[in-house]
Amino acid sequence: APTSSSTKKTQLQLEHLLLDLQMILNGINNYKNPKLTRMLTFKFYMPKKATELKHLQCLEEELKPLEEVLNLAQSKNFHLRPRDLISNINVIVLELKGSETTFMCEYADETATIVEFLNRWITFCQSIISTLT
């Protein structure tokens, strides 16, 4: 059974991940972002189901495409370089989902824009956090 300290750690990691994803979304949606129309041509795959921490595997698999889109902005809308930002997210995701479990991600048929993709994972984080508090 999870201890209160491990639950607290999970909650903090999820909150950190949530803030990172929200920061990216805000940077993309910034009215000064001249690359938005091009960014919105990038296609992302969404999980068929995302209700447990193991489903973060689906996010992990889409981090490389996410970095490529963020590279378009050339850090103008972000405090960190895309590589560093994605690296930070990757570390959190690996810790949260656990590396010992091998979960095969199932994706929905429909593709999503970067905005839809980020909103989906933001909702995921908020949902899991609410079950922990």
Partner: antibody, heavy 121, light 107 residues
Framework: EVQLVQSGAEVKKPGASVKVSCKAS????????IQWVKQAPGQGLEWMGA????????RYIQNFKGRVTMTRDTSTSTVYMELSSLRSEDTAVYYC??????????????WGQGTLVTVSS | DIQMTQSPSSLSASVGDRVTITCITS??????MNWYQQKPGKAPKLLIY???TLRPGVPSRFSSSGSGTDFTFTISSLQPEDIATYYC?????????FGGGTKLEIK
């Protein structure tokens, strides 16, 4: 080897429609945007629009909106560009070309051989 | 739409010459500039893409520089097989736009 093979030359009357095909091979068809470029005789290059074969999403330039339709058939890895209400200034070579990298919009790396469309009464 | 001003529209040079083509954009496009070579009756060929990156297999005599609004394409030592029309393309935002082209001829 990546290849884009286009349909043959067409001669059309003003007001008619033309449908140019572009058959892709040598890569994962559904994960690269296919873009279309027009080149009128002796003129430069003009970007027309694009389609993402994975979901059929399209982008069209304002000049062609309403007259151009891009579609795809994933079973045959073929993209189509249909231009309606043809006029003499539509006489051109039309190229399909693949985006340099997957998922998003980049410059075009591989190109079809071009299809000459002649509009003449 | 982003406007592209490519110059010169034509130029004549001798084998071994250094050749320079410029492209100026109406807005800042970072380094999202690409350069194509087109020979008569053929499809354009991508030589250099975003970030002044030379495509694999393209001879090193071709290079480019610039970011923001001012871009330069250079052939360090013109070869007979370089006779073609060259185009710049901005891939910063939609719709993509091409420069008017530069027709290169041998003196």
């Amino acid at each position: 080897e990546v290849q884009l093979v286009q349909s043959g030359a067409e001669v059309k009357k003003p007001g008619a429609s033309v449908k140019v095909s572009c058959k892709a091979s040598g890569y994962t068809f559904t994960t690269y945007w296919i873009q279309w470029v027009k080149q009128a005789p002796g003129q430069g290059l003009e970007w027309m629009g694009a389609i993402y074969p994975g979901d059929g999403d399209t982008r069209y330039i304002q000049n062609f909106k309403g007259r151009v339709t891009m579609t795809r058939d994933t079973s045959t890895s073929t993209v189509y560009m249909e231009l309606s209400s043809l006029r003499s200034e539509d006489t051109a070579v039309y190229y399909c070309a693949r985006s340099l990298a997957t998922r998003g919009f980049y410059a075009m790396d591989y190109w079809g051989q071009g299809t000459l469309v002649t509009v003449s009464s | 739409d982003i406007q592209m001003t490519q110059s010169p529209s034509s130029l004549s040079a001798s084998v071994g010459d250094r050749v320079t083509i410029t492209c100026i954009t109406s807005t800042d496009i970072d380094d999202d500039m690409n350069w194509y070579q087109q020979k008569p009756g053929k499809a354009p060929k991508l030589l250099i893409y975003e970030g002044n990156t030379l495509r694999p297999g393209v001879p090193s005599r071709f290079s480019s520089s610039g970011s923001g609004t001012d871009f330069t394409f250079t052939i360090s030592s013109l070869q007979p097989e370089d006779i073609a029309t060259y185009y710049c393309l901005q891939s910063d935002n939609l719709p993509y736009t091409f420069g008017g082209g530069t027709k290169l001829e041998i003196k």
